[in-house]
């Protein structure tokens, strides 16, 4: 008789999850000389230890501490790019502007990007059928707790001017329920961070509105200024041109507003 298995509302663990994590770790440490000392088998063991045999609605930040320790990485604190609901463009940007870093440009962020995982209480099995959904099932699930933990640490490390890329096509350009809005904003350290600069990315070609005046951006400014951090905002009207100008800043068309 097959054993009854908990059915969750979210998709199950990404197929070939252990192999993917291990392969990504090896690839990352090969590309980044400063992380060559990392033992990828130990990283996988620590990752696995955070959620295997544990109830997938009862995961804590402490569960991930061994992994956090192994994945400790120093990125230039004044070169941090946060993003919300516009991951692809943020990643395209840091691929061109190599001295800036999103969370997914760090080892731990790179390992977990776009993956889902969970285990089952009291068994060493990985659940490939379903995993808890943040809204429908529980917030303390392995994936959500992982991203909350690494996002908090990433924000805490930031200094000087921190940039955040926001999606101007969404109804809530700044969403306080996003990881950026609920975790990163509140963990920027006023003693170290002087300014948060928001880049609001426009979607439509003919969209000439000043989205920095959007009520949700005003809300972000309020939250940030109350933390004693300065706030600035720029409209990126032409994201395609923006990226092109990052690649070729000498281009004559790059002096005009983008």
């Amino acid at each position: 008789v097959p054993r009854w298995r908990q059915q969750w509302s979210g998709p199950g663990t990404t197929k070939r999850f252990p192999e993917t994590v291990l392969a990504r770790c090896v690839k990352y440490t090969e590309i980044h000389p400063e992380m060559r000392h990392v033992d990828c088998q130990s990283v996988w063991d620590a990752f696995k230890g955070a959620f295997i045999s544990k109830h997938p609605c009862n995961i804590t930040e402490e569960d991930y501490q061994p992994l956090m320790k192994l994945g400790t990485q120093t990125v230039p604190c004044n070169k941090i790019l946060l993003w919300s609901r516009i991951k692809d463009l943020a990643h395209q940007f840091t691929q061109v502007q190599r001295d800036m870093f999103t969370l997914e440009d760090t080892l731990l962020g790179y390992l977990a990007d776009d993956l889902t995982w969970c285990g089952e209480f009291n068994t060493s099995k990985i659940n490939y059928q379903s995993c808890p959904d943040w809204r429908k099932d529980c917030s303390n699930n392995p994936v959500s707790v992982f991203w909350k933990t690494v996002s908090r640490r990433f924000a805490e490390a930031a200094c000087d001017v921190v940039h955040v890329m926001l999606n101007g096509s969404r109804s809530k350009i700044f969403d306080k329920n996003s990881t950026f809005g609920s975790v990163e904003v509140h963990n920027l350290q006023p003693e170290k961070v002087q300014t948060l600069e928001a880049w609001v990315i426009h979607g439509g070609r003919e969209d000439s509105r000043d989205l920095c005046q959007d009520p949700t951006i005003k809300e972000l400014e309020s939250i940030i200024s109350k933390r004693n951090i300065q706030f600035s905002c720029k409209n990126i009207y032409r994201p395609d041109k923006f990226l092109q100008c990052v690649k070729n800043p000498e281009d004559s068309s790059c002096t005009s507003e983008i």
Epitope: K172, K176, S182, V183, H186, P215, S225, K226, R227
Partner: antibody, heavy 125, light 111 residues
């Protein structure tokens, strides 16, 4: 509405915890919940605020850091823990909600629109 | 630090008259300033937020807020006996590095 409780007569050096209980709304909509005090015959003095959307965002007046602790203890209660009390802490302590303004609960300073009646703390030797 | 200086500390005004209360911030506060009215034995009542917006339908249009940057003013016109109270300004711009978000208060005495 808001209601403060826990005010008392205490000796110098004592600790005390005040509780603010919300009725008719809860903290699933994000607010800044603030504590303000008023010594007899004096003006309003801001103690600090907690952003109910994130336990990481708690703010204190520079003079209150270390001796005062604000916490969200449930979806309808916020507490103010006070330690090493002195006669200068004798005051009525108010809890206030710094409201959202604009549509869809955007928080960009709507002012403290809801206040409790206050609870009296007297420190005497 | 964000310090709020309120003047005058006390003012006397005749019924029907006009009174102005000033509030100066030590740094720009982006018009995130509120005004409150407090009567003895009561908690404060919000009158104006974001420097110039009336807080609720119950607040008389005789109360007018103005200003920007670091200088703000509350003007009460057509003063009534019921306006006798202490008025406070409060900045909502920064909660970091603040001694007191409130001004010192202005007592309005109505003759």
């Amino acid at each position: 509405s808001l209601e403060e409780s826990g005010g008392d007569l205490v000796k110098p050096g004592a600790s005390l915890t005040l509780t603010c209980t919300a009725s008719g709304f809860d903290f699933t909509t994000y607010y800044y919940m603030c504590w303000v005090r008023q010594a007899p015959g004096k003006g309003l003095e801001w103690i600090g605020c907690i952003y109910t959307g994130s336990s990481d965002s708690i703010y204190y007046a520079s003079w209150a850091k270390g001796r005062f602790t604000i916490s969200k203890t449930s979806s309808t209660t916020v507490t103010l823990q006070m330690s090493s009390l002195t006669a200068a802490d004798t005051a009525t302590y108010f809890c206030a909600r710094d409201r959202p303004s604009g549509n869809d609960d955007y928080i960009y300073d709507g002012g403290m629109d809801l206040w409790g009646p206050g609870t009296l703390v007297t420190v005497f030797s | 630090a964000y310090d709020m200086t309120q003047t005058p500390a006390s003012v006397e005004v005749a019924v029907g008259g006009t009174v102005s209360i000033k509030c100066q911030a030590s740094q720009t506060i982006n018009s995130w300033l509120s005004w409150y009215q407090q009567k003895p034995g009561q908690p404060p009542k919000l009158l104006i937020y974001q420097a110039s917006k009336l807080a609720a339908s119950g607040v008389s249009s005789r109360f007018k807020g103005s200003g920007s940057g670091t200088e703000y003013t509350l003007t009460i016109s057509g003063v009534e006996c019921a306006d006798a109270a202490t008025y406070y300004c409060q900045q909502g711009y920064s909660f970091g590095n603040v001694d007191n978000a409130f001004g010192g208060g202005t007592e309005v005495v109505v003759k």
